[in-house]
Interface confidence: medium
């Protein structure tokens, strides 16, 4: 998971946008990636980075046999 996220985050050169990606990786099953992205006011580049990293991280976790993760964070 870490390697894949680092690979995606490397595409985003701007530090603020890179942070948006890392914010998206945080586990949070209280809301979907789309719900969380909809509240981002920084700008479209941040929304794109957040959403891509959030979706990829969630799908990787889902494929990792649904281990008992700390959901909701």
């Amino acid at each position: 998971l870490q390697e894949k996220i680092e690979e995606i985050a490397a595409k985003y050169k701007h530090l603020v946008v890179k942070k948006c990606c890392y914010d998206g990786v945080r586990i949070n099953h209280d809301e979907t990636c789309e719900q969380r992205a909809a509240r981002i006011s920084v700008g479209p580049r941040c929304v794109k980075a957040f959403t891509e990293c959030c979706v990829v991280a969630s799908q990787l976790r889902a494929n990792n046999s649904h281990k008992d993760l700390q959901l909701g964070r």
Partner: antibody, heavy 119, light 112 residues
Framework: EVQLVESGGGLVQPGGSLKVSCAAS????????MQWVRQAPGKGPEWVGL??????????EYAASVKGRFTISRDDSKSIVYLQMSSLKIEDTAVYYC??????????WGQGVLVTVSS | DIVLTQTPLSLAVSPGEPASISCRSS???????????LDWYLQKPGQSPQILIY???NRASGVPDRFSGRGSGTDFTLKITKVEAEDVGVYYC?????????FGQGTKLEIK
């Protein structure tokens, strides 16, 4: 182990106000959204609202049935979430549960606190 | 709001027999993040609800393996392979795909 303990329930007249509290332990409170769910006697659970963690703005969302009358707040320093209820109606009579997705997957529920609105 | 329709609303099963509860959603509960935002809870008499299944099909820690969840998108099923006396109570499905989270009406399981 995640624990949620509600307090402050009781009998209140229609139009009155009441504030219930939920003390949380066993997890890093500031890292999690907190929610309230209620259950009227003999009925199924109904979501009341949530408060996001500060990192996500600490903002709130409410069910249409309580919007404008109920307010959720949190005190991260004390690991407590509050539900302030005003302009109470008879149909607000219910057991109010504090819930969270802290700890194991799924919602963890408190024991609930009974709020009775009656004249 | 997303509407969850549970069937049946009540169920009487003999010990050792199977039981099945359906939960149908008015919208897909599978999000683009790959997670299915559907849980199953059991509320035993006089108690708070307790988690059985999360993510549509993942058994929560400590839940006996006679409980299983299946389904995707809009149609979900909770199965109990062999019902035991301690399984009595009301079963609820819950969606948290969209705000507000909504519950099914509940299915009351009784022992014959």
């Amino acid at each position: 182990e995640v624990q949620l303990v509600e307090s402050g329930g009781g009998l209140v007249q229609p139009g009155g106000s009441l504030k219930v509290s939920c003390a949380a332990s066993g997890f890093i409170f500031s890292d999690y959204y907190m929610q309230w769910v209620r259950q009227a006697p003999g009925k199924g659970p109904e979501w009341v609202g949530l408060i996001r963690k500060k990192v996500n703005g600490g903002t709130t969302e409410y069910a249409a049935s309580v919007k404008g009358r109920f307010t959720i707040s949190r005190d991260d320093s004390k690991s407590i979430v509050y539900l302030q209820m005003s302009s109470l109606k008879i149909e607000d009579t219910a057991v109010y549960y504090c819930v969270s997705r802290a700890g194991p997957p799924g919602l963890t529920w408190g024991q609930g606190v009974l709020v009775t609105v009656s004249s | 709001d997303i509407v969850l329709t549970q069937t049946p609303l009540s169920l009487a099963v003999s010990p050792g027999e199977p039981a099945s509860i359906s939960c149908r959603s008015s919208q897909s509960l599978l999000a683009s993040d790959g997670y299915t935002y559907l849980d199953w809870y059991l509320q035993k008499p006089g108690q708070s609800p307790q988690i059985l299944i999360y993510g549509g099909s993942n058994r929560a820690s400590g839940v006996p393996d006679r409980f299983s969840g299946r389904g995707s998108g809009t149609d979900f099923t909770l199965k109990i392979t062999k019902v035991e006396a301690e399984d009595v109570g009301v079963y609820y499905c819950l969606q948290h795909r969209a705000l507000p989270p909504t519950f099914g009406q509940g299915t009351k399981l009784e022992i014959k």
